[in-house]
Interface confidence: low
Amino acid sequence: AGYVFRDKVMSEFNNNFRQQMENYPKNNHTASILDRMQADFKCCGAANYTDWEKIPSMSKNRVPDSCCINVTVGCGINFNEKAIHKEGCVEKIGGWLRKNV
């Protein structure tokens, strides 16, 4: 039962994270939550950083600044792959959730 519950938590988290990405950065509250997660967990996007390319409000060569290894204003523009966290947040935060939920 515990595994089923954890899988459900992961699935819900994945869906919710992707939904919040769609609202970035139009919704300031959403943006600050996602930015905090990405910066704290050193991750970028849901599955990986390329997820941001699919978001209408983000240009093809941009990720949120919170994806950067060294976060500064504008660091996510025309980014260098070596300078950002490439791992997705669902897996990374999911691992933390599995241990703690």
Epitope: K54, P56, S57, S59, R62, V73, G74, C75, I77, N78
Partner: antibody, heavy 119, light 112 residues
Framework: EVQLQQSGPELVKPGASVKMSCKAS????????MHWVRQTPGQGLEWIGY????????KYNEKFKGKATLTSDKSSSTAYMELSSLTSEDSAVYYC????????????WGQGTSVTVSA | NIMVTQSPSSLAVSAGEKVTMSCKSS????????????LAWYQQKPGQSPKLLIY???TRVSGVPDRFTGSGSGTDFTLTISRVQAEDLAVYYC????????FGSGTKLEIK
């Protein structure tokens, strides 16, 4: 209010180079892409390239590679474009255009710099 | 490069009339993964710089009067001005930003 103030008109001789400036105000200079676009009666509007002032990353239209060089100075919030080996075909109005990265149509246009190439 | 073709090249209408202008791209500018058309419309009044009116093919920029409407998807787009006013005298350009950046040659709107 976003403003892009471009340098004045230039009259230059064929074969010479020219460097024009675009001073930005009213927004965080490093968080926008700065495009350069030229307008001629014959060719209409043509995208030259853009620079991301945060990291000085550039992207050029193939047609203008070797012709245009884009740079920026973060300390003065100013973007520059240098054009080399000028010919009469380079006579045009050149615009700098700030592109808000939330959608990347071209949002804020400078007033334009007129360049006339004549012997 | 994606080519952008506008028609007509010019048109003259009386104030209060409805006007439509067309923009066609040589290939689709619809990004299927999020159903957005990478197409914008600009207005350039005589002696002025171009001004962004519409992006994502149909989203009006804040402050642009609602008589300006962008529509279309894929390769065929239209800018409609529902009740033309004297101040709308300008050249209107469409612009694709799906693959690099290219502009149409413009439609000149004159007021009779």
């Amino acid at each position: 209010e976003v403003q892009l103030q471009q340098s004045g008109p230039e009259l230059v001789k064929p074969g010479a180079s020219v460097k024009m400036s675009c001073k930005a105000s009213g927004y965080t200079f490093t968080s926008y892409v700065m495009h350069w676009v030229r307008q001629t009666p014959g060719q209409g509007l043509e995208w030259i390239g853009y620079i991301t002032p945060y990291n000085d990353g550039t992207k050029y239209n193939e047609k203008f590679k070797g012709k245009a060089t884009l740079t920026s100075d973060k300390s003065s919030s100013t973007a520059y474009m240098e054009l080399s080996s000028l010919t009469s075909e380079d006579s045009a109005v050149y615009y700098c255009v700030g592109g808000d990265n939330y959608y990347y149509a071209m949002d804020y246009w400078g007033q334009g710099t007129s360049v006339t190439v004549s012997a | 490069n994606i080519m952008v073709t506008q028609s007509p090249s010019s048109l003259a209408v009386s104030a209060g009339e409805k006007v439509t202008m067309s923009c066609k791209s040589s290939q689709s500018v619809l990004y299927s993964s999020h159903q957005k058309n990478y197409l914008a419309w600009y207005q350039q009044k005589p002696g002025q710089s171009p001004k962004l009116l519409i992006y994502w093919a149909s989203t009006r920029v804040s402050g642009v009067p609602d008589r300006f409407t962008g529509s279309g998807s894929g390769t065929d787009f239209t800018l409609t001005i529902s009740r033309v006013q004297a101040e709308d005298l300008a050249v209107y350009y469409c612009h694709q930003y799906f693959s690099s950046f290219t502009f149409g040659s413009g439609t000149k709107l004159e007021i009779k």
